[in-house]
C-alpha cells in the first residue's frame, strides 16, 4: 500500500493514522493510544485495539458464562498494557494501582491485587466459541451452505488459517462457531483467533474497524445473515484461578 | 451460474484511453474483492489492481499506478478498469477475477474469459 | 516488494510420474499463497489456496505444502490432462504477485 495512492489508509483498521513516511514513502499506519505501528494486511492485535478504543470509549462489553472454566468479559473496557508486539501484558493495573491477571485476549481471569500481585506467564486462550442468534428468516439456513459461508468469512474477511475453524454449529436460530488454536499451532504470520473473533464480535454490533463504510455483509446464498445477539466464550490452556469467594 | 463477462477491449494508439468493464452474475457481487489481472502475449499472469467489496481500498500494481483506475458499481454488478496513457507494454489480454469475500486480498476463484486489449499506432 | 520465485521454469515428465513445483517468496506470507493451472488457450483455475487447502472440484492428486517463504505444488500421478502452466500467487496484502509459471509437459 503505497502513499503514491490518493488513500493512505490501514484497510485493516480504521483506528490508525497514516502518513507517508515509512520505507520508500510508504504508507505507514500507527494505532490511535499507543502509537505502535501496525500492519495493515492484517488484524491489529486486541491490546492495540483496546488501548485505541479507549480515546473514544464505547459501552462496556458483558459476556455469560457456559461452565465454571468459561471466562466472563464483564469489567468493562480498561485501558491495557501492551508488549512490544501488541500482545496484553500478563498483568493488568489500573490507576488505582489495583492489579489482575489476563489471558492473551485480555479477559480477567484472577481476582483482583495490588501491585504485589505476580502473573508469571500470559495464559493462551486456545478455544472460543461464539454463539450467535440470528434474526428470523423464511426458513432455516441450510447447515452446509451456513458452514461454508462462516469459515469463508473467517478465512478471506479475518484472514484466520482454516484449520483454526474448528467447527461450526447450528440450530435455528442459533449459530455456534469454535475457534482453536493451540500455542503449538500457531505460526508466525497467523492471525490469532482472540483477534478474529474481537473483529467478527465488533463486526456483528455494526462496530466494524475495517476501514470500509460497508460494514460486515454475511449472506447465506444471497439471503442476509442478520446477528441480533451474540456470546462469546473463552478457554484457556490453564483454568483461571478465582477464590471460592467469587463464586458464590 | 456463476460468472464474469468482460467487454471493451480493442486496439487503441499509445496515448489515448480505454475502459473494459466486467459484469457479474450468479453471486452476490458486492460481498465481494474484485480483481484486475492481465497476460501479456505468450508471457505469465501479471496482478494489476484490486477493489474491496465496499469500494473502501484499491491498490494498484507500480507499473500502472497514475495511468490505471479501477471502480466498481455494485448496483449494476459492474467492475471497471479505466485505462488512461496507454503504453505498448499494457498489450494484453485483462481478466477480471473475484477475490475475497468481505474483502480485497484472497486468492482468485473465478474468472472471467478475457477482453484483449492491443496498444498499438 | 514480495518477490515470488517459481522453479523450475518447465519440466517434462512421463504420466503416473510425482511432480513437484516450488514457490520462494523473498520474504515471509504466511499462508497466503494460491496456486493456478492454465491450461492452453485456456482461463487460469484456482487449485489451492492458503498454500494447503484444495479447491472444490480439483482432484486430490494435486497437493500444496509450505509456510512462510517456501510452498510446493505436488502432482502425485502426473495425467495427460495436467499438460499446462503452473502460477504461485501470494495474496498477503497488494501487490498481489504471481511467480514467473512452470511450464508442465508429457515426456
Known amino acids: 500500500h503505497t502513499a503514491a495512492q490518493d488513500n493512505c489508509t490501514c484497510p485493516t483498521n480504521k483506528m490508525t493514522v497514516c502518513s507517508p513516511d515509512g520505507p520508500g514513502g510508504r504508507c505507514q499506519c500507527r494505532a490511535l493510544g499507543s502509537g505502535v505501528a501496525v500492519d495493515c494486511s492484517t488484524l491489529t492485535s486486541e491490546c492495540l485495539l483496546l488501548k485505541a478504543r479507549m480515546s473514544a470509549p464505547k459501552n462496556a462489553r458483558t459476556l455469560v458464562r457456559p461452565n465454571e472454566h468459561a471466562l466472563v468479559d464483564n469489567d468493562g473496557l480498561y485501558d491495557p498494557d501492551c508488549d512490544p508486539e501488541g500482545r496484553f501484558k500478563a498483568r493488568q493495573c489500573n490507576q488505582t494501582s489495583v492489579c489482575w491477571c489476563v489471558n492473551s485476549v485480555g479477559v480477567r481471569r484472577t481476582d483482583k491485587g495490588d501491585l504485589s500481585l505476580r502473573c508469571d506467564e500470559l495464559v493462551r486462550t486456545h478455544h472460543i466459541l461464539i454463539d450467535l442468534r440470528h434474526r428470523p428468516t423464511a426458513g432455516a439456513f441450510n447447515h452446509s451452505d451456513l458452514d461454508a459461508e462462516l469459515r469463508r468469512l473467517f478465512r478471506e474477511r479475518y484472514r484466520l488459517h482454516p484449520k483454526f475453524v474448528a467447527a461450526v454449529h447450528y440450530e435455528q436460530p442459533t449459530i455456534q462457531i469454535e475457534l482453536r488454536q493451540n500455542t503449538s499451532q500457531k505460526a508466525a504470520g497467523d492471525v490469532d483467533i482472540g483477534d478474529a473473533a474481537y473483529y467478527f464480535e465488533r463486526d456483528v454490533k455494526g462496530e466494524s474497524l475495517f476501514q470500509g463504510r460497508g460494514g460486515l455483509d454475511l449472506r447465506v446464498r444471497g439471503e442476509p445473515l442478520q446477528v441480533e445477539r451474540t456470546l462469546i466464550y473463552y478457554l484457556d490452556e490453564i483454568p483461571p484461578k478465582f477464590s471460592m469467594k467469587r463464586l458464590t | 451460474q456463476v460468472q464474469l463477462v468482460e467487454s471493451g477491449g480493442g486496439v487503441v494508439q499509445p496515448g489515448r484511453s480505454l475502459r473494459v468493464s466486467c459484469i457479474a452474475s450468479?453471486?452476490?457481487?458486492?460481498?465481494?474483492?474484485m480483481h484486475w489481472v492481465r497476460q501479456a502475449p505468450g508471457k505469465g499472469l501479471e496482478w494489476v489492481a484490486v477493489?474491496?467489496?465496499?469500494?473502501?481500498?484499491?491498490d494498484y500494481v507500480d507499473s500502472v499506478k497514475g495511468r490505471f483506475t479501477i471502480s466498481r458499481d455494485n448496483s449494476k454488478n459492474t467492475l471497471y478498469l479505466q485505462m488512461n496513457s496507454l503504453r505498448g507494454e499494457d498489450t494484453a489480454m485483462y481478466y477480471c477475477?473475484?477475490?475475497?469475500?468481505?474483502?480485497?486480498?484472497?486468492?482468485?476463484?473465478?474468472w472471467g474469459q478475457g477482453t484483449m486489449v492491443t496498444v498499438s499506432s | 516488494d514480495i518477490q515470488m520465485t517459481q522453479s523450475p521454469s518447465s519440466l517434462s515428465a512421463s504420466v503416473g510420474d510425482r511432480v513437484t513445483i516450488t514457490c520462494r517468496a523473498s520474504?515471509?506470507?504466511?499462508?497466503?499463497l494460491a496456486w493456478y493451472q492454465q491450461k492452453p488457450g485456456k482461463v487460469p483455475k484456482l487449485l489451492i489456496y492458503?498454500?494447503?487447502t484444495l479447491q472444490s472440484g480439483v482432484p486430490s492428486r494435486f497437493s500444496g505444502s509450505g509456510s512462510g517463504t517456501d510452498f510446493t505444488l505436488t502432482i502425485s500421478s502426473l495425467q495427460p490432462e495436467d499438460v499446462a502452466t503452473y502460477y504461485c500467487?501470494?495474496?498477503?496484502?497488494?501487490?498481489?504477485?504471481f511467480g514467473g509459471g512452470t511450464k508442465v509437459e508429457i515426456k
Open positions: 477475477a473475484r477475490g475475497g469475500y468481505n474483502s480485497g486480498w484472497w486468492a482468485f476463484d473465478i
Open positions: 450468479g453471486f452476490f457481487f458486492s460481498s465481494y474483492g
Open positions: 477493489i474491496w467489496y465496499d469500494g473502501s481500498n484499491e
Open positions: 520474504q515471509g506470507i504466511s499462508h497466503f
Open positions: 492458503a498454500a494447503s
Open positions: 500467487q501470494k495474496f498477503n496484502s497488494a501487490p498481489l504477485t
